[in-house]
């Protein structure tokens, strides 16, 4: 049975420009996280393999970097990086495991960053 | 320029083990993932596992799991691959593969190691 | 595990024809699809990644697309040397798996 449960950073805004942390942790659950793949939409930005290491899609290598930890960091945002990013969590026993964020990249200077959230 | 050399064909009774070798030269052998894939005679491509030179990660293929063991010596930057409890349907052309930095493709093949599985 | 079902298994061409292969993921694998060429008696070799990307020394006549499940290889005008097997991998979740392999034949 698939006991845990994702936070994540919920809502968050950011300036053009700037860059974002994008952060889950999974919780309430003995699983072992073997891999996280990060998408946006239909696209794979990043995977976050326990072993392996991380895999960057070419396509954003200029523009995410791995971490911390197990997040995320996307840099130079452009109001095109509006919208849902999907942390999905593959575990063992307990299988798949997704979280949403949303994300709005604003024009303005007076951008509300959505609080750090620290993995405890 | 990158090369992988893969020891030389072995022929294996049933029950036994072997262990193939791969020597890795021109870059820096912690920097890239070491993967094997075995290839069934006219069959297609199947992947063993990977080691991570960097961390010491391991990761297999569950179908292979207790039977094959992934090693490196990292002061000849060689891996290993060595598998156990052979049957005939080990019998296979195995290839060491390193993956690109920061990228899940096998980007250099060693040539190919022949293992014979035959009483 | 997720299954890789490349088709056709082989095809017939002749040079400077268009050939193209499609691989269908069992399931979502988003654009984590790689392909690769292998000719007999030789290791394989990377050509498209991500899966649109060309590896280095890789010529502009092959191409890759798709996203999701449905992924395809293009060939815009086939070459001599172009007539090998080709396999189609996903990396998406672990095992990684290829697809069984599809053989360029000349006609």
């Known amino acids: 049975m698939m006991t845990g449960t994702i936070e994540t950073t919920g809502n968050i805004s950011a300036e053009k420009g700037g860059s974002i942390i994008l952060q889950c942790h999974l919780s309430s659950t003995t699983a072992q996280v073997t891999q996280v793949n990060w998408e946006q939409q239909d696209q794979l930005l990043a995977i976050c393999n326990a072993d392996l290491g991380w895999h960057i899609s070419p396509s954003f290598k200029d523009r995410v970097a791995p971490g911390p930890g197990l997040g995320l960091t996307l840099q130079s945002l452009t109001v095109n990086d509006t919208g849902e990013y999907f942390c999905i969590y593959h575990t063992y026993p307990d299988g798949t495991y997704t979280g949403r964020i949303f994300l709005e990249v604003l024009e303005s200077s007076v951008a509300e960053h959505g609080a750090r959230f620290q993995i405890p | 320029e990158v090369q992988l050399v893969q020891s030389g064909a072995e022929v294996k009774k049933p029950g036994s083990s072997v262990k193939v070798s791969c020597k890795a030269s021109g870059y820096t052998f912690t920097e890239h993932v070491i993967h094997w894939v075995r290839q069934a005679p006219g069959q297609g491509l199947e992947w063993i596992g990977g080691f991570n030179p960097n961390h010491d990660g391991t990761i297999y293929n569950q179908i292979f799991r207790g039977r094959a063991t992934l090693t490196v010596d990292k002061s000849t930057s060689t891996a290993y691959m060595e598998l156990s409890s052979l049957r005939s349907e080990d019998t296979a052309v195995y290839f060491c593969?390193?993956?690109?930095?920061?990228?899940?493709?096998?980007?250099?093949w060693g040539q190919g190691t022949t293992v014979t599985v035959s009483s | 595990d997720i299954q890789m079902t490349q088709s056709p298994s082989s095809l017939s061409a002749s040079v400077g024809d268009r050939v193209t292969i499609t691989c269908k993921a069992s399931q979502h694998v988003s654009n984590a699809v790689v392909w690769y060429q292998q000719k007999p008696g030789k290791a394989p070799k990377l050509l498209i990644y991500?899966?649109?990307y060309r590896f280095t020394g890789v010529p502009s006549r092959f191409s890759g697309s798709g996203s999701g499940t449905d992924f395809t290889l293009t060939i815009s005008s086939l070459q001599p040397e172009d007539f090998a097997t080709y396999y189609c991998q996903q990396h998406y979740s672990t095992p990684w798996t290829f697809g069984g392999g599809t053989k360029v034949e000349i006609k």
């Open positions: 991500s899966p649109s």
């Open positions: 593969t390193r993956a690109a930095k920061l990228l899940f493709a096998m980007d250099y």
